[in-house]
Amino acid sequence: LEASEEVELEPCLAPSLEQQEQELTVALGQPVRLCCGRAERGGHWYKEGSRLAPAGRVRGWRGRLEIASFLPEDAGRYLCLARGSMIVLQNLTLITGDSLTSSNDDEDPKSHRDLSNRHSYPQQAPYWTHPQRMEKKLHAVPAGNTVKFRCPAAGNPTPTIRWLKDGQAFHGENRIGGIRLRHQHWSLVMESVVPSDRGTYTCLVENAVGSIRYNYLLDVLERSPHRPILQAGLPANTTAVVGSDVELLCKVYSDAQPHIQWLKHIVINGSSFGADGFPYVQVLKTADINSSEVEVLYLRNVSAEDAGEYTCLAGNSIGLSYQSAWLTVLPEEDPTWTAAAPEAASHHHHHH
């Protein structure tokens, strides 16, 4: 074999409807290019159940499987699945042959292949078709929400899927509202979850050849009524130079719909507080949590007058929470001068 020669399935067109089961022997160091479907509708290539990325030394790209230089770890089972389905278009095993340096130059490269189109589909143990969609293993959802677990798989014969909860068969008969099992989507759906739905959910995918399983852990958060929670340390004390831009950040967590305001503390008639004991404030920004970037207060081209105390105030039907920070503004001409913020620079308070 010449070093430049590639192992290639010709032509690079859509395969016949019958699945191609093939075994190819590839010399170490040899480039490989295998095709599956027309370029614009090419299938997705998987190695041992993991989808190949479109970039890298071994890549699946526009229906092509490309290996720059075949290495021992590249040997194994490769599958091409039709886009948008789990139909196996190509099913082949790459086997490591001799390295190019020791290969027999008289050998016909085609003798490395078994391209017979078998009419009987080969049996295959179940495997995950989209493991990247199963990456989120730990789920925590508020009570009343809908939960959907998916375990997309394939195999031959087509596997069956069943679900366990905490190791026991789970059909949802004891669950108010039951469950929805969508076998064609390999999914379990539970609507309006409650604390008793907490547990370990296992999908068990089986066929005559083998079985695989995957666990999801579910926690259900009880909607205990509470005022908004503000992330500690935000907004943060900030120092800026005259003319610069400043961003103050406030992170709000709330089950009930929260309402957020940004306030600046001001002085009226020489006093910071009114007769009622509350501070004088100016409302700079107000909105609900769904508004774009309401949790950020932008101050453009700051001047000395912008220095002072700023408060993020969040309220819901249960109560109010607020945290404050100080903005210190330094003059451009004398960067050595610093305005000292009060000792207790960052406050956080809760009001019922």
Partner: antibody
Framework: EVQLLESGGGLVQPGGSLRLSCAAS????????MAWVRQAPGKGLEWVSV????????VYADSVKGRFTISRDNSKNTLYLQMNSLRAEDTAVYYC????????????WGQGTLVTVSS | QSVLTQPPSASGTPGQGVTISCSGS????????VNWYQQLPGAAPKLLIY???LRPSGVPARFSGSKSGTSASLAISGLRSEDEADYYC????????????FGGGTKLTVLG
């Protein structure tokens, strides 16, 4: 800045009990899964237990099941590990770790607290 | 006996590259992503690689991870003396219970 600070370790006799604490700061504790991982002297890491944000969902390693209890107090931003019926093989540095909510790895670890079980 | 198998030791000289392997089974690495942790002498473990091949911010590009089937590997290029540490692979395991399994750890020595 995310910080996890374990405490409560010490010397205890076989059969005794100990309660470890992990004070969390710099993140919204009540929204994260948390875990305990231990490391016996000169040995590798061993996962001990995991707990959901509500505190109502817990999982344990077989080696501690029935003896250890993981819990949390979200109002105090604190994770706990109650260890009962302690054995010599429980001697280890115990780390608390935050679990990343996206891909379920331990993204932040505490500095650890040493538990020694010996008579 | 760790569920994931790692070589107990590895070594290299400064500037060299080294690869640490981690072998598992279909119930752990085969079904779940692999994470790598670095433990410097006397310190707590620190996340090095997550989701097979992703680096947290602050981890140099010299560290890279990969996974194929039921095995994973951590590659370190351009070795530096500060890379001398224990390295652990980990993954969730979907056996009869859900739990996390670790490799036994690989002690990396940077020679000279």
């Amino acid at each position: 800045e995310v910080q996890l600070l374990e405490s409560g370790g010490g010397l205890v006799q076989p059969g005794g009990s100990l309660r470890l604490s992990c004070a969390a700061s710099g993140f919204t504790f009540s929204t994260y899964w948390m875990a305990w991982v231990r490391q016996a002297p000169g040995k590798g890491l061993e996962w001990v237990s995991v707990i959901g944000p509500s505190g109502g969902m817990t999982v344990y390693a077989d080696s501690v099941k029935g003896r250890f209890t993981i819990s949390r107090d979200n109002s105090k931003n604190t994770l706990y590990l109650q260890m009962n019926s302690l054995r010599a093989e429980d001697t280890a540095v115990y780390y608390c770790a935050r679990i990343n909510s996206g891909s379920s790895h331990f993204d932040y670890w505490g500095q650890g607290t040493l538990v020694t079980v010996s008579s | 006996q760790s569920v994931l198998t790692q070589p107990p030791s590895a070594s290299g000289t400064p500037g060299q590259g080294v690869t640490i392997s981690c072998s598992g089974s279909s119930s752990n690495i085969g079904s779940n992503s692999v994470n790598w942790y670095q433990q410097l002498p006397g310190a707590a473990p620190k996340l090095l690689i997550y989701s097979n091949n992703l680096r947290p911010s602050g981890v140099p590009a010299r560290f890279s991870g990969s996974k194929s089937g039921t095995s994973a590997s951590l590659a370190i290029s351009g070795l530096r003396s500060e890379d001398e540490a224990d390295y652990y692979c980990a993954a969730w395991d979907d056996g009869l219970d859900a739990y996390v399994v670790f490799g036994g750890g690989t002690k990396l020595t940077v020679l000279g």
